[in-house]
Each structure stands twice: as C-alpha cells, then as structure tokens.
C-alpha cells in the first residue's frame, strides 16, 4: 500500500462512553490535524474510511456497518453507535484518502459501565460555582447532535442515587440545573439523564459532572501576607540557622496564577552567592482559597547576611504585595567577669 500520513494514536482524545447508550464520535483528523473540514475533503473527492482494533488485539479490521438496526453507522465525519456495547472498546482509526492522498489517525474508545448511582471509571468534568453568588446554572454537557431540535427529550437530574426533586436551593430546569445560592453543601457529583425517542426506540444519554463551590469574586482580595509581619523580629547570632516563613493567603480567582517569591537585597535568591534554600507548601480551604508558605532558610548565617534586606513578594490577578522581614543580629550577652563586674562598681 502507498504511503499514508499516519498521525499515530491520539491519546489526548481518550474517549469514554457509557455502555448501552448512543455515542457520536467525530473523526479527529478534521478537528486537530488537517487544515480543512470534511465538506471540503468530500467535495475534493476524498473518502473517509473507518476501521478498528479490538481491545487486546493487534489485528486491524473493518467496522461492520451491517449490524441489525444499523447499530454502528457513519454519517459524514461522525461514527455513530446506537447504542454502544461493552466489547466496542478498542482503538478506532479514521483514514481520509483518494488515489494520491492519504492521512489517518487512531484514537482509543473505552465503553464503560455505570452503576445505579452513576458511579463509573469515567473521568468527570469539574464545574466551579461561586459561593453565595446568586443564581448560577450548570448545563447537561455533550448532548448536541444526538437528536433534532424538533425532538423534545425528557431530562432528569440526580445527585448520586437520588433524583433532584425538591432540594432546598437546586432547581432542575430542563437541560439546566439552577443553584439559587450555591453553598459548600452543593459540592458533589450531578448527573443528567436525557431520554429521547428515535425510530421507535428510546435512548438514554447519561452525563455526570462534579460541582465544586469556590470563593466568590465578590469577596476576592489582593494577596494577604500574614508572615513576615511587624510583630516578629528574626534575631540571630552568626552561625545560627535563619528560617523566615513567608505565608500568603490568596482568594480563589478563576484562572489566576498565584505567585510567591523572596528577594534578598532586591535580587532573586538564585542570583546571589549565599547558600539559601527555599521550601514551598500549599494548602487550600474548602472554597479553594489558597495559602502558600515559602520558608527561606540559611543554614549558617553570617553577620553580613543579617544586614541584608529579606522581602517576601506575592502576586495574583488581584494585585501584587510585598513585605520585608525584620532581621537583626542578636546583641551578645554580656561577659560576666568584665561587664557585670564593672556594672557593680568593682575596680
């Protein structure tokens, strides 16, 4: 066979679908690899061919499009399962070709089982809701293209095993689930089951997502440096270890990059010759506010080091702040024989 541009196995598209449900899978060539769409390819005389390799097999085989009730079919650049079976799991390849051109890509498809409470190995998308922010909605995801707009499906929403009917602050509204005022108690997995008719059969689409209630932008503040502060003085003798924590609180901000760093005499620790180590730890509150601690450590501090300026800096999308640590050399305790004796008036 002549050469074909093989894009290999596209593991970025690990497609998971539920057993015994319809699935529509677009050929990834047109979405990620080629600069033209299916319509252009088709009008240029290119043909889209599908085949697959079963799980735990090496043999590529054509897809059987002659199954009863057209269980597997192809429509333009979409491969349809109506519905899937567990043993449809495998690597699927779509190949676009004519006599002079060939391009193909493979992708893994995993058909997974769910239990009566919608638990499964499916990776769940996370939807973040702001705490106490007024009405917010989540929408039943990835159901476009399964049925025409003339078909009116029934949608049922669940939290775990339980149909949402009269929750205090959660209202099912068709494809949307409305949270009147999101609270921490609303954290969890929510499932929509979309039921629609097609050619005398009834199909179900199950979609589960995780809701995580996070800090509201209404309450967001610039970073707050708790340490160093004006109340603590780091007083050391030369030769001792100097440890200064920089502890910063960051309000949750969607897509914000939180940064903490130290400067010593205005320079980054990497840019100076002294032997400094910095260890960072991060913790999160239930609403994903973040506390970062960077501990600056000098194992054996010198009198020169104790004269330097140590400044903790923090930055988020809300602003930038800095705070200097109060570092000083400990005054040595008086030597009894001389200083104290003089103090008592001895001659």
């Amino acid at each position: 066979s002549e050469r074909c541009d093989d894009w290999g196995l596209d593991t970025m598209r690990q497609i998971q679908v539920f057993e015994d449900e319809p699935a529509r899978i677009k050929c990834p060539l047109f979405e990620h690899f080629l600069k033209f769409n299916y319509s252009t390819a088709h009008s240029a005389g290119l043909t889209l061919i599908w085949y697959w390799t079963r799980q735990d097999r090496d043999l590529e085989e054509p897809i059987n499009f002659r199954l009863p009730e057209n269980r597997i079919s192809k429509e333009k650049d979409v491969l349809w399962f109506r519905p899937t079976l567990l043993n449809d799991t495998g690597n699927y390849t779509c190949m676009l070709r004519n006599t002079t051109y060939c391009s193909k890509v493979a992708f893994p498809l995993e058909v997974v089982q769910k239990d009566s409470c919608f638990n499964s190995p499916m990776k769940l998308p996370v939807h973040k809701l702001y705490i106490e922010y007024g009405i917010q909605r989540i929408t039943c995801p990835n159901v476009d293209g399964y049925f025409p707009s003339s078909v009116k499906p029934t949608i049922t929403w669940y939290m775990g095993c339980y149909k949402i009917q009269n929750f205090n602050n959660v209202i099912p509204e068709g494809m949307n689930l409305s949270f009147l005022i999101a609270l921490i108690s609303n954290n969890g997995n929510y499932t929509c089951v979309v039921t629609y008719p097609e050619n005398g059969r009834t199909f179900h689409l199950t979609r589960t997502l995780t809701v995580k209630v996070v800090g509201s932008p209404k309450n967001a503040v610039p970073p707050v440096i708790h340490s160093p502060n004006d109340h603590v003085v780091y007083e050391k003798e030369p030769g001792e270890e100097l440890l200064i924590p920089c502890t910063v609180y960051f309000s949750f901000l969607m897509d914000s990059r939180n940064e903490v760093w130290w400067t010593i005499d205005g320079k980054k620790p990497d840019d100076i010759t002294i032997d400094v180590t910095i260890n960072e730890s991060i913790s999160h509150s239930r609403t994903e506010d973040e506390t970062r601690t960077q501990i600056l450590s000098i194992k054996k501090v010198t009198s020169e080091d104790l004269k330097r300026s140590y400044v903790c800096h923090a930055r988020s999308a809300k602003g930038e702040v800095a705070k200097a640590a109060k570092v000083k050399q400990k005054v040595p305790a008086p030597r009894y024989t001389v200083e104290l004796a003089c103090g008592f008036g001895a001659t």
Epitope: C117, N119, M159, C161, Y162, N168, S185
Partner: antibody, heavy 122, light 107 residues
Framework: QVQLVQSGAEVKKPGSSVKVSCKAS????????IQWVRQAPGQGLEWMGY????????DYAQKFQGRVTITADESTSTAYMELSSLRSEDTAVYYC???????????????WGQGTLVTVSS | EIVMTQSPATLSVSPGERATLSCRAS??????LAWYQQKPGQAPRLLIY???TRATGIPARFSGSGSGTEFTLTISSLQSEDFAVYYC?????????FGQGTKVEIK
C-alpha cells in the same frame, strides 16, 4: 463509625399521630439519605420514604403519601418520621437506615437503627 | 412498582448443608439487587449488594448471583448463626422494593 439510635416504644390510639426520632452519631460530612422502613409483626419490610437532611429533599412511598412526614434537624443530626391518622394496621417496628453517602449504589441501607415499636390500640 | 417474589417461603436445612434462596423481579433490575439477613428482635443487616458483592464483614460462605430478573443467594455451609429470615431488595427503580422474605430454619 456511624450509628443510628432511635427513640423508644410508643403506644398510640387510633386516629392519633406518632413521631419517631433517629439520631446519627459519628456522621461524616458527606451528604447522605435517611430511609424509613417499617415491619408489621410477622411481616416483611416496607419502604416508607427518605430524607436527604443536608438538602431537605424528601420522597415518600405512594402508600404513605399524605399521612407521613419526614423531617430532619441538621444541627442535631436527627431525622424524624411522623405518621398521622394511625390505625391498628400501622402497628409495626419502624426502622431508620442510611448509607455513608448519596453515591453508594446498593448500600443506602447499610446502617440501621435498632427499631421503634409503635403499637396502635384503643 | 417492581414486585419482588422470594421462594421458598420457608427453607428447612441442616447445619453444614448448602442453602439456596431465590428472588425474582417482575421486570429487569439489572444487577441492582441487595440481600439482607434479619434475626428475631434485630434490625436487618446488609449481606450482598450489586447482586454479588459481599458487604463489609460478611463471611465468604454467603454468595449472590444473577442479573435481570432471576437472583440467587447461596449459603455454602450453614452455621447456627445463619438461621434467620432473608430479604431481597431491588434498587433499580423507585420505589425501592423488598421481597416478602425466606425463613431459613433448622431441619
């Protein structure tokens, strides 16, 4: 370890109401549901309804609709089942039961209370 | 609602023997079936869920099988503490429903 402790036995007159309590101890923070099930003397188990205390959602078996009210007090981790217009055939042991979370398929009746005998007699 | 029918109503077995209890659903409940054990004066105890998964702390002599409408609970070698009433329950469709029970008594 989660435990459910129910209120003591009750003797009631026909036409009156009874309110049985079920207190959860050692509760995890996860939301859960409390189920109510009854068992008449020498008979099988009959599901009556449930409540999800954290969300206030209740659902009742058709048979008890209009006569049963399930409530919960989150602050004391206590659920209540009130049955009104009692008749002699309501004489039964009333159980509360729960799972660890809302997500445990098949384990929503994992932990049971000790049962409360309600006798309806004139 | 789904009706669960258990058979036999009473099963007489000698200690050490195998006991096989049946449960039939009026329509398919997939594998969404649980078994409970109840001793006199006690609350029921979950034995099996998902038709075949033993609950925490349940001895290996208890096993469940079946799917759809036909289910079986097997006690491989009856111990004295196993004489009790056993209930099946479906949790595939609301309302969740119990069978009427099978009493396992000493022969």
């Amino acid at each position: 370890q989660v435990q459910l402790v129910q209120s003591g036995a009750e003797v009631k007159k026909p036409g009156s109401s009874v309110k049985v309590s079920c207190k959860a101890s050692g509760s995890p923070a996860e939301p859960y549901a409390i189920q109510w099930v009854r068992q008449a003397p020498g008979q099988g188990l009959e599901w009556m309804g449930y409540i999800i205390p954290l969300h206030g959602q209740v659902d009742y078996a058709q048979k008890f609709q209009g006569r049963v009210t399930i409530t919960a007090d989150e602050s004391t981790s206590t659920a209540y089942m009130e049955l009104s217009s009692l008749r002699s055939e309501d004489t039964a042991v009333y159980y509360c039961a729960r799972g660890q979370t809302l997500y445990d398929s098949g384990r929503q009746f994992d932990i049971w209370g000790q049962g409360t005998l309600v006798t309806v007699s004139s | 609602e789904i009706v669960m029918t258990q058979s036999p109503a009473t099963l007489s077995v000698s200690p050490g023997e195998r006991a096989t209890l049946s449960c039939r659903a009026s329509q398919s409940v997939s594998s969404n079936l649980a078994w409970y054990q109840q001793k006199p004066g006690q609350a029921p105890r979950l034995l099996i869920y998902g038709a075949s998964t033993r609950a925490t702390g349940i001895p290996a002599r208890f096993s469940g099988s079946g799917s759809g409408t036909e289910f079986t609970l097997t006690i491989s070698s009856l111990q004295s503490e196993d004489f009790a009433v056993y209930y099946c329950q479906q949790y595939n469709n609301w309302p969740w429903t119990f069978g009427q029970g099978t009493k396992v008594e000493i022969k």
